[in-house]
């Protein structure tokens, strides 16, 4: 049997294999050692008995999408049946006093990989270590602590495979420099030791995406906007647009990126080198926002055509340091992937390719409350003898839309610990002037927050107010 027969559901066309070469990976045309790694088909009854106490679930994640030329990382996490855990030596043990289908468990081994009779098996250079091999018969690497590695992980994609030892997590990265854009499938099969062989305990696959467009996300925020996720914003207040480029391997770290904005309100094209930009819409309505992100990245040089001279190449910026490499990361408390794959080298040719990313959104602009301010604070005269509470009248004014609700929050002087919160519907005149009366429980300094809201907006102002003692000469003080 070959690797492709054992691992692959998706048959990978030969003409694609030529192009999509992964450095350090091997062709799935290689022979699979069926004696050491028995092959079970989907639905084989042996799967259910491959792990004591239930099934092991493998969870595969990636940091897809990846821009062509960047690295993409895959992580497999093994989830053991209830009441099982990995101990510090990599053995799988039952948790103490944990209730599963078998009742209360004691802290006994489920699988004791490293103890007792197997110890001789780990020695180098003996016939007994012939089984310490991967499915293609390559010997296991032997870095420090490798005996704690309980599992063999076989990653398979693009007609190639990569093998590594690990504990309950394993991580592999590939460089996408030669890969074709589009969705691809990564499959991982996990094996455990079974005497002097290895049996499959879990299989998982996940779609990942390689793209020739820069993956772009934009966050939009605005002061006084009540709901940041509804793409409804307020007129006459700046909206902050922040562009996030998905680039976890920092492939674009040394590339100059330009941002071209069209806000759809006939204000023209804005070109910026900064990932954040403010824009204020001055009309109500619905607008189509368009962003184009552009950068030049290292890429292959076009072959010189006999009829035309080669185009002058853009002066290169220095390659990132270190050179982009494929990483073979590691399982928990385990090495990085000993003698692991190298990543594709950057070509010595200093050509660059323009890459683009696009973002579009439809945003709605409405009128909202733009500003709130406290115009006046007055002490409400109280009958003698004075009660413990002090009453204050606040005159509050606003700009923009008419508020429907007013809230007052009275808190400690740091404005952190709320003591009292009162909200009520309000009716205000065309001038947006309202009077709010609030009681203060005793003398001291208070933080007073006023928020005025309508459907789309929520505007806030704060003041510190000092409530005097009952001495008639002590003045009321407000500190804005």
């Amino acid at each position: 049997k070959r690797f492709r027969d054992v691992l692959g559901h998706e048959q990978y066309p030969d003409h694609m294999r030529e192009h999509n070469q992964l450095r350090g990976w091997s062709s799935d045309e290689n022979e699979w050692d069926e004696h050491l790694y028995p092959v079970w088909r989907r639905g084989d009854g042996r799967w259910k008995d491959s792990w004591e106490g239930g099934r092991v679930q493998a969870v595969l994640t990636s940091d897809s999408p990846a821009l062509v030329g960047s690295n993409i990382t895959f992580v497999v996490n093994l989830v053991f049946p209830r009441c099982q855990k990995e101990d510090a030596n990599g053995n799988i043990v039952y948790e103490k006093n944990c209730r599963n289908d078998l009742g209360l468990t004691s802290d006994l081994h489920v699988y004791n990989w490293t103890a007792g009779a197997d110890d001789g098996d780990w020695e180098d250079g003996t016939s007994r270590s012939q089984h310490l091999r991967f499915p293609d018969r390559r010997p296991f690497p032997r870095p420090h602590g490798w005996k704690k590695w309980s599992f063999v992980y076989v990653f398979h994609t693009l007609g190639q495979y990569f093998q590594k030892l690990g504990r309950c997590s394993a991580r592999v990265s590939i460089n996408t420099v030669n890969l074709t854009a589009g969705p691809q499938v990564m499959e991982v099969t996990v094996f455990r030791r079974y005497g002097r062989a290895y049996i499959p305990i879990s299989k998982v696959k996940d779609v990942y995406v390689i793209t020739d467009q820069i993956p772009v996300f934009v966050t939009m925020s605005q002061k006084n906007d009540r709901n940041l996720s509804d793409e409804i914003f307020l007129r006459d207040l700046p909206i902050v647009f922040d562009v996030l480029i998905h680039d976890p391997s920092h492939f674009l770290n040394d590339s100059a990126i330009s941002y071209k904005w069209n806000f759809g309100d006939n204000t023209g094209l804005f070109v910026s080198n900064n990932h954040t930009l403010n824009h204020t819409y001055v009309l109500n309505g619905t607008f189509n926002l368009n962003l184009t992100v552009q950068t030049a990245v290292p890429g292959p040089c076009p072959p010189p055509s006999p009829s035309t001279p080669p185009p002058p190449s853009t002066p290169p910026s220095p390659p990132p340091s270190p050179l982009p490499t494929l990483s073979t990361p590691s399982p928990s408390l385990m090495p990085t992937g000993y003698k692991s794959m190298e990543l594709s080298d950057i070509s010595n040719e200093n050509c660059r390719i323009n890459r683009y990313g696009y973002f579009r959104a439809t945003i709605t602009i409405v009128e909202g409350i733009l500003e709130v301010s406290i115009m006046q604070i007055a002490d409400v005269p109280m009958p003698t003898p004075q009660p413990a509470n002090s009453l204050m009248d606040f005159t509050v004014t606003c700009k923009g839309a008419t508020p429907m609700e007013a809230c007052t929050i009275i808190s400690d002087p740091t404005c952190q610990i709320a003591q009292n919160r009162v909200c009520s519907p309000v009716a205000v005149d065309g001038l947006c002037l309202l009077s709010v009366r609030r009681a203060f429980n005793g003398s001291g300094t208070y933080c007073v927050n006023f928020t005025l809201g309508d459907d789309a907006s929520l505007a806030l102002t704060s003041t510190l107010i000092s409530i005097p003692g009952k001495d008639p000469d002590s003045p009321l003080r407000a500190v804005n």
Epitope: V59, T61, V75, S169, R171, H250, P329, S330, P335, E342
Partner: antibody, heavy 116, light 108 residues
């Protein structure tokens, strides 16, 4: 005995760059990932990124706005983090820490102060 | 990214008492959670990984539990050397691996 020895404190001006080092000893340097974590005064910990010393492949936390580049010198078993375009918000203690996906040994920390 | 929320932010206890610190993940992280201890002016130290496994050399009075989104670290019979800050961190899936906000454990 595993040890991660970091370079000393740094005082730099806004806009400047700095390169912090972390010298590993007591284990095979290329066998384990090297992580960088920062801690602003009185705050929690933030993972900045990691590097596989075997071949230099690195991964970064995009959610934090620190401009970091991670490198290694295998011959001296030393990991480096260069921070560029520094602002006062980058003032923090920066730690190197061994392993993936959690960190079993930590350096003593390098205090970076960015101030004009 | 997965968010980690730790509580309480601070805690006072006496030597000999038992305390529990909790950590909540914004999505299912199975058992891929780690706890660190950090003493004033020092580097963090690994206590527990995979939610329940004690790191080498960690006293058995420390125990981790939980899975999915809810986790806790229990310290039985507090010792003077246990006071300091504690942080949870997830280690599920691809990086970044985020930390909780921390819990400061002080002597009462």
């Amino acid at each position: 005995e595993v040890q991660l020895q970091q370079s000393g404190p740094e005082l730099v001006k806004p806009g400047a760059s700095v390169k912090i080092s972390c010298k590993a000893s007591g284990y095979t340097f290329t066998d384990y990932y090297m992580n960088w974590v920062r801690q602003s005064h009185g705050k929690s910990l933030e993972w900045i990124g990691d590097i596989n010393p075997y071949h230099g492949g690195s991964t970064y936390n995009q959610k934090i706005k620190v401009k970091a580049t991670l490198t290694v010198d295998k011959s001296s078993s030393t990991a480096y983090m260069e921070l560029r375009s520094l602002t006062s918000e980058d003032s923090a203690v920066y730690y190197c820490a061994r392993n993936w996906p959690y960190f079993d040994y930590w350096g003593q920390g390098t205090t970076l102060t960015v101030s004009s | 990214d997965i968010q980690m929320t730790q509580s309480p932010a601070s805690l006072s206890a006496s030597v000999g008492e038992t305390v529990t610190i909790t950590c909540r993940a914004s999505e299912n992280i199975y058992s891929f959670l780690v706890w660190y201890q950090q003493k004033q002016g020092k580097s963090p130290q690994l206590l527990v990984y995979n939610a329940k496994t004690l790191a080498e050399g960690v006293p058995s009075r420390f125990s981790g539990s939980g899975s999915g989104t809810q986790f806790s670290l229990k310290i039985s019979s507090l010792q003077p050397e246990d006071f300091g800050s504690y942080y949870c961190q997830h280690h599920f899936g691809t990086p970044p691996y985020t930390f909780g906000g921390g819990t400061k454990l002080e002597i009462k």
